[in-house]
């Protein structure tokens, strides 16, 4: 550790009194202390020696001595306290600045330590301090306000009794300074913008911090415009608030705009999109297939996407037929909006009914004129299958009959013994009917198709089976032939036919 | 052995603020006092101010209303900030180590800053 | 304008003696001691002499510099081309209560 001579922990001496403090080390060393007038410094070997010819007040302060070459960074330290009858404060800063709950040094040193049982600390014009200032005092140091608040940024001055009046230090300024958590709040309004050529617009950029200190601006395609600012502070915070009227826009107005804000603790920014057109326009389209297939019983939303300017006048959905002049309730219909100028409008239709299958309209209107936009909705139908046994051109043939959507598949097979449906073990024959003839086929109907097995003789100890399937599922329909004539088992009941 | 960097933009337009860093590394910010200097070009040398740790600022008075000094210790930097600029703060800014009886021993190597539209 | 006056211009051939000098006033020079910076081209100034007439570690002993009541001078010995640059002189100022400079001399080694 560096030794300093005198070897006092304290110096007082007069003004124009020469002082030489020396600072000794095993190598180099360095005086450290607040920059005052009159010091020269000069090295005599391992020693560093700090001196002045003409004391003033303003040498009053701590001088500390230091080795730069010590691993364990030992330092030796001298106050030297010059004191003039005049000045009984030397005043080391204009200003201090601290954050809330900092300890705020103001750094007012006493020049004659004698004082130090009269000081105080004071607003300037002699304005007592805010309540709950809670301050310490040190003479070497200052005077110390504990957990300092952003209110108490307030200029001080210091204080002392000398001959019975109160003699004041020059202020100190004291800026609090909130504890930023980060880069301003940004609120860029609105988030999209569009607007037909010639009408007004509004762009709105708001910024706030805790602090005062931040920059807002608001830029259009990467060019800073020139905008006044109106300023607030309100719930703590302060606000700054460029606002950008356009009487009549034009198109060189469209673009992006960039509200951007920035503190010293970085940057934060928002954009916008400003569309101007030529004129008003009403767009409709859905990322649905606007032809729907659905099973019957289950349900359906239909959506719409629209995209507007300006806002819509109108819109409904209607049912086009072909069953019934029943018109969607209203209940099943809702609008969403996206934002300004996008909407999304559903029609829900849960439990499909037979007479519900067709067509759906939504029409929607504004300035620029009405558009619609249909869904064509089919139902899909598990085959139903009958059979029926026939003569055709003299030859007995068995005629079955299967309707669903979409169109079914039909396959007959033979199997052994009387049964409701053959099962692999009983199966004789397979025929596959790859062109059914096709009975009926309208939009928004079931298909109807027939199929024909032409047999020469019928086995009375077999069963012949029609079977249908489609996508949505499969229907069948057993004959089985009796000496009466022809017994037929649809899937859950039984029919005779002589 | 003690260094100090400047950091900042190069470019600031007129009326606003000018923002300076100064990272001090190889020794710590907690002892000396801390400088700044600016430097036009062609021209001589100006204190700004300094800031001592304890957040203790004194300024230049020709410069003093638009001058703002803080210090950072946590990441060994003190800071400058210059409000109201004009053309004629267009200047190489340095930031300097303030020692008693051999003031500005150690500098960085400067930032160049000029003030325009 | 600067508070302390120093020439603009000094020049000498490589080998010559050169002196720099730098006037001030009581409240600076004549009261405070003199510290002199050089600044080569395109760097930072870097101190030279402290304290009148002191020179930190490493720097050559051709630089001296001394002070006479409200003046000082720089002197450069045995000029060599490398100390062509700016020098400064800078002092402590009561009034300002922090640090004032010259102007700065241009050496030019001819």
């Known amino acids: 550790i560096p030794v300093i001579e005198p070897s006092v922990p304290e110096l007082v001496v007069k003004p124009g009194a020469t002082v030489t403090l020396r600072c000794v080390g095993n190598g180099s060393v360095e005086w450290d202390g607040p920059p005052s007038p009159h010091w020269t410094l000069y090295s005599d070997g391992s020693s560093s020696i700090l001196s002045t010819n003409n004391a003033t007040f303003q040498n009053t302060g701590t001088y500390r001595c230091t080795e730069p070459g010590d691993p364990l960074g030992g330092s030796a330290a001298i106050h030297l306290y010059v004191k003039d009858p005049a000045r009984p404060w030397n005043v080391l800063a204009q200003e201090v600045v601290v954050f809330e709950d900092q300890d705020a040094l103001l750094p007012c040193l006493l020049t004659d330590p004698v004082l130090e049982a009269g000081v105080s600390l004071v607003r300037v014009r002699g304005r007592p301090l805010m309540r709950h200032t809670n301050y310490s005092f040190s003479p070497w140091h200052g005077f110390t306000i504990h957990r300092a608040k952003f209110i108490q940024s307030q200029d001080y001055q210091c204080s002392a009794l000398m001959g019975g009046r109160k003699v004041m230090s020059i202020s100190i300024r004291l800026k609090v300074q909130k504890v930023i958590p980060g880069p301003p709040a940004l609120t860029l309004v609105p988030a999209e913008l569009v607007r037909i050529r010639g009408e007004a617009a509004q762009i709105v950029c708001s910024a706030s911090s805790v602090d005062v200190n931040f920059d807002v601006f608001l830029q259009h395609n990467n060019t800073k415009l020139a905008i006044p600012q109106q300023s607030d502070f309100h719930n703590n915070r302060y606000q700054k608030v460029l606002t950008l009227n356009l009487d009549q826009v034009d198109f060189q107005h469209a673009g992006n705009y960039s509200c951007v804000a920035s503190n010293v603790q970085g940057k934060h920014s928002t954009s916008m999109f400003f569309r101007v057109v030529e004129s008003a326009y009403l767009n409709l389209s859905s990322e649905q297939n606007l032809i729907q297939e659905v099973t019957v019983g289950e349900g359906l939303n239909l959506k719409v996407m629209v995209e507007a300017y300006p806002g819509l006048q109108g819109f409904n959905w209607t049912y086009l037929g072909p069953f019934s002049d029943h018109q969607p309730e209203p209940k099943l219909a809702n609008a969403t909006t996206k934002d300004t100028y996008r909407h999304t409008f559903t029609l829900s239709l849960p439990r499909l009914k037979p007479s519900e299958a067709g067509r759906y309209s939504f029409l929607a209107r504004n300035p620029g004129g009405w558009r619609a936009l249909t869904f064509e909705l089919t139902l899909r139908y598990p085959p139903e299958v009958s059979v029926i046994w026939t003569f055709i051109n003299g030859s007995g043939t068995l005629l079955c009959a299967a309707s669903g959507y979409p169109q079914p598949n039909v396959t007959w097979l033979q199997c052994s013994g009387h049964t409701d449906r053959c099962d692999e073990a009983q199966v004789l024959q397979v025929w596959d009917d790859p062109y059914p003839e096709v009975l009926s086929q309208e939009p928004f109907h079931k298909v109807t198709v027939q199929s024909l097995l032409t047999v020469e003789t019928l086995e009375h100890n077999q069963t012949y089976e029609c079977r249908a399937h489609n996508s949505v599922g499969s229907g069948s329909w057993a004959f089985i032939p009796i000496s009466a004539g022809a017994h037929t088992h649809p899937p859950d009941e039984f029919l005779f036919t002589p | 052995q003690v260094q100090l960097q400047e950091s900042g933009p190069g470019l600031v337009k007129p009326s606003e603020t000018l923002s300076l860093t100064c990272t001090v590394s190889g020794g710590s910010i907690s002892s000396y006092y801390w400088s700044w200097i600016r430097q036009p070009a062609g021209k001589g040398l100006e204190w700004i101010g300094r800031?001592?740790?304890?957040?203790?600022?004194y300024n230049n008075p020709s410069l003093k209303s638009r001058v703002t000094m803080s210090v950072d210790t946590s990441k060994n930097q003190f800071s400058l900030k210059l409000s109201s600029v004009t053309a004629a703060d267009t200047a190489v800014y340095y930031c300097?180590?303030?020692?008693?009886?051999?003031?500005?021993?150690?500098w960085g190597q400067g930032t160049m800053v000029t003030v325009s539209s | 304008q600067s508070v302390l006056t120093q020439p603009p211009s000094a020049s000498g051939t490589p080998g010559q003696r050169v002196t720099i000098s730098c006037s001030g006033s009581s409240s600076n020079i004549g009261s405070n001691s003199v510290n002199w910076f050089q600044q080569l081209p395109g760097t930072a100034p870097k101190l030279l002499i402290y304290?009148?007439?002191q020179r930190p570690s490493g720097v050559p002993d051709r630089f001296s510099g001394s002070k006479s009541g409200t003046s000082a001078s720089l002197a450069i010995s045995g000029l060599q081309s490398e100390d062509e640059a700016d020098y400064y002189c800078a002092a402590w100022d009561d009034s300002l209560n922090g640090p004032v400079f010259g102007g700065g001399t241009k050496l030019t080694v001819l």
């Open positions: 800031i001592y740790i304890s957040g203790s600022i």
């Open positions: 304290s009148n007439n």
């Open positions: 300097a180590r303030d020692r008693v009886g051999m003031t500005f021993d150690i």
